[in-house]
Amino acid sequence: MAPTSSSTKKTQLQLEHLLLDLQMILNGINNYKNPKLTRMLTFKFYMPKKATELKHLQCLEEELKPLEEVLNLAQSKNFHLRPRDLISNINVIVLELKGSETTFMCEYADETATIVEFLNRWITFSQSIISTLT
């Protein structure tokens, strides 16, 4: 079925929501004053070999659990990330965006990445797809 303007708009809104969530996480942790940043950077994330289509969000979905574990270190009284809720929201968006009709096997790059590199990669992906929709 060809994408309608309403489905394109919905996809764009979902991607913008995903983008905002990823940017919020990055801004929350990537602060040189964050006491835990250096230790958070010791965690490694798998990066997609290729990320150009919505189906490639499978690669993000598979790394959401490790992401939640690292975000559990990032809380403070004035910065309520609530990792479980945040990751749950991202998971819902990712599932809707990538669709469940076809099974896609994610291919990962050989080199692992830090949480900052990982988030930046998926932020760039979201921005890129949004730009093709507008």
Partner: antibody
């Protein structure tokens, strides 16, 4: 019982290499960072560096960078601290400790018993 | 690196005494409303043991006679009624900035 058990005391000559160990038990070793702390005779405590046993990622105190290497083998729940060429000034007690950083905190909740390293000609 | 200055460096006290140890940081160890300051006890020939984390939280299993307070740059460890097993060296530690640093220690001896 959650514990970290370190290898026994070592007596070495200057220039020799050494690798001491810290074995975790009673918890998921890969899920917690392990830190190394030095205590020179009659002195205070100095943080050396940290390893994430799950990923192998490390971070060092600038003072110890290039002087020691921190590694881990998660399959046997063990972290290591090694020297390629010991100096007399490396004589100290070395502790491994488990880092806890969930929520609003960052502290060492479990410590190894310590490994005494003596370097003398 | 953040410097932690403990005072006094050592003192003598008797069982039952109220003991106060201070730790002053060269800059704030607070981050977004939380104090990244911990206290450890070390007995001769033994590894340090966690007493207090995040300035005022008592570690599980540590007697309630130990308490911690403070924020920013000034912190205090208090032992409300000194017991024989409390004669040891006490260290404060900041975990707000790398490298993590410890105070020089305060040795509590029997009078």
């Amino acid at each position: 019982e959650v514990q970290l058990v370190q290898s026994g005391a070592e007596v070495k000559k200057p220039g020799e290499s050494l690798k001491i160990s810290c074995k975790g038990s009673g918890y998921a070793f890969s899920n917690y960072l392990i830190e190394w702390v030095r205590q020179m005779p009659g002195k205070g405590l100095e943080w050396m560096g940290v390893i994430n046993p799950g990923s192998g990622g490390t971070y060092y105190n600038e003072k110890f960078k290039g002087q020691v290497t921190i590694s881990a083998d998660k399959s046997i729940s063990t972290a290591y601290l090694q020297w390629s060429s010991l100096k007399a000034s490396d004589t100290a007690m070395y502790y491994c400790a488990r880092w806890r950083g969930e929520g609003y905190y960052a502290y060492y909740d479990v410590w190894g018993q310590g490994t005494t390293v003596t370097v003398s000609s | 690196a953040i410097r932690l200055t403990q005072s006094p460096s050592s003192f003598s006290a008797s069982t039952g005494d109220r003991v106060t140890i201070t730790c002053k940081a060269s800059q704030s160890v607070d981050y977004q409303g939380d104090s990244y300051l911990n206290w450890y006890q070390q007995k001769p020939g033994k590894a340090p043991k966690l007493l207090i984390y995040a300035a005022s939280n008592l570690e599980s299993g540590v007697p309630s006679r130990f308490s911690g307070s403070g924020s920013g740059t000034d912190f205090t460890l208090t032992i409300s009624s000194l017991q024989s097993e409390d004669f040891a060296t006490y260290y404060c530690q900041q975990s707000n900035e790398d490298p993590y640093t410890f105070g020089g220690g305060t040795k509590v001896e029997i009078k």
